[in-house]
Amino acid sequence: APVRSLNCTLRDSQQKSLVMSGPYELKALHLQGQDMEQQVVFSMSFVQGEESNDKIPVALGLKEKNLYLSCVLKDDKPTLQLESVDPKNYPKKKMEKRFVFNKIEINNKLEFESAQFPNWYISTSQAENMPVFLGGTKGGQDITDFTMQFVSS
């Protein structure tokens, strides 16, 4: 069976939107009005992995682009990147672990924990216009909580 996917946008808990900044980077910033069209639309695929009531494994691709968020070690540091894939083979039910995030719902907010690197999360800075990153903290200054907005296909 084909992998189930939905289109969505994400905003952090400060209501910053995610936009492309160069070919392989996402930044988080506040957008208003017509500028909201700049925010990236994700194709969130529901993939194979450890699942529970509040934890669902997903992959986050960029809609109509052959780019996926992935987690790799760079200079010994778990790092978030946008990775190009062969569109003929993706998305798939059994995604490589670096592409998998545990979508965790807590109090109507979402966290995205790396499956490859437990206790590392898709994060944004409090500061405006900074790259989205894989962070190792929760409950401090950096932001790990998101809301999801559904986008019709």
């Epitope: 200079d75 540091k77 590392w120 190792g136 903290t137 409950g139 401090g140």
Partner: antibody, heavy 118, light 108 residues
């Protein structure tokens, strides 16, 4: 009130090890990156390394080639930095500081003077 | 490793005058630069974060600007208590976090 309180001054002989502590209070210890920065007498600031209390990840300045070990105790909100094989050039004030991911170190400990002398 | 270069090494400014301190990064760091003040015998104190973001409790005479590789810390009207060493630090690409070598600010 956010506070980082460090252990007292140490005098060590070359080749020995030293372990400095940094007790955090007034904030969520696991919500920040905890750094160690040192300053030799009359010199500038040098980043030693960091620990992430939430997941116990550590990374340090390659200059120290495995001589630095950073640990933490989340039950007491304390970070530790141990430096081994001490040499005279390690004589410095060692500071702990907290930051966000991009390294804005907004609170610092008072510093711990480590003197290495035969 | 990103190298941060500060200039001048020493700056002498008259009380009430403007002081301008510079920091150059060896590669593009966006706005991921932070400025610190350190007085003798004290720990550094964060003055400005993310190139231009002010810090609660820091006097408004301190401001920062720049992006990419060129950055400036400005003290609009120098006070005697501003005599200190000032450091810039990058957090865009780590490890390692790197500091500039410092600018010593003196009263003329």
């Amino acid at each position: 009130e956010v506070q980082l309180v460090q252990s007292g001054a140490e005098v060590k002989k070359p080749g020995a090890s030293v372990k400095v502590s940094c007790k955090a209070s007034g904030f969520s210890f696991t919500g920040y990156y905890m750094h160690w920065v040192r300053q030799a007498p009359g010199q500038g600031l040098e980043w030693v390394g960091l620990i992430i209390p939430h997941n116990d990840y550590t990374v340090n300045n390659q200059k120290f080639k495995g001589r630095v070990t950073m640990t933490r105790d989340t039950s007491t909100s304390t970070a530790y930095m141990e430096l081994s094989s001490l040499r005279s050039e390690d004589t410095a004030v060692y500071y702990c500081a907290r930051s966000d991911y991009y390294g804005a170190m907004d609170y610092w400990g008072q510093g711990t003077l480590v003197t290495v002398s035969s | 490793e990103i190298v941060m270069t500060q200039s001048p090494a020493t700056l002498s400014v008259s009380p009430g005058e403007r002081a301008t301190l510079s920091c150059r990064a060896s590669q593009n760091i966006g706005t991921s630069i932070h400025w610190y003040q350190q007085k003798p015998g004290q720990a550094p104190r964060l003055l400005i974060k993310y190139a231009s973001n002010s810090i609660y409790g820091i006097p408004a005479r301190f401001s920062g600007s720049g992006s990419g590789t060129e950055f400036t810390l400005t003290i609009s009207s120098l006070q005697s208590e501003d005599i200190a060493v000032y450091y810039c630090q990058q957090g865009a690409s780590w490890p390692p976090f790197t500091f500039g070598q410092g600018t010593k600010l003196e009263i003329k």
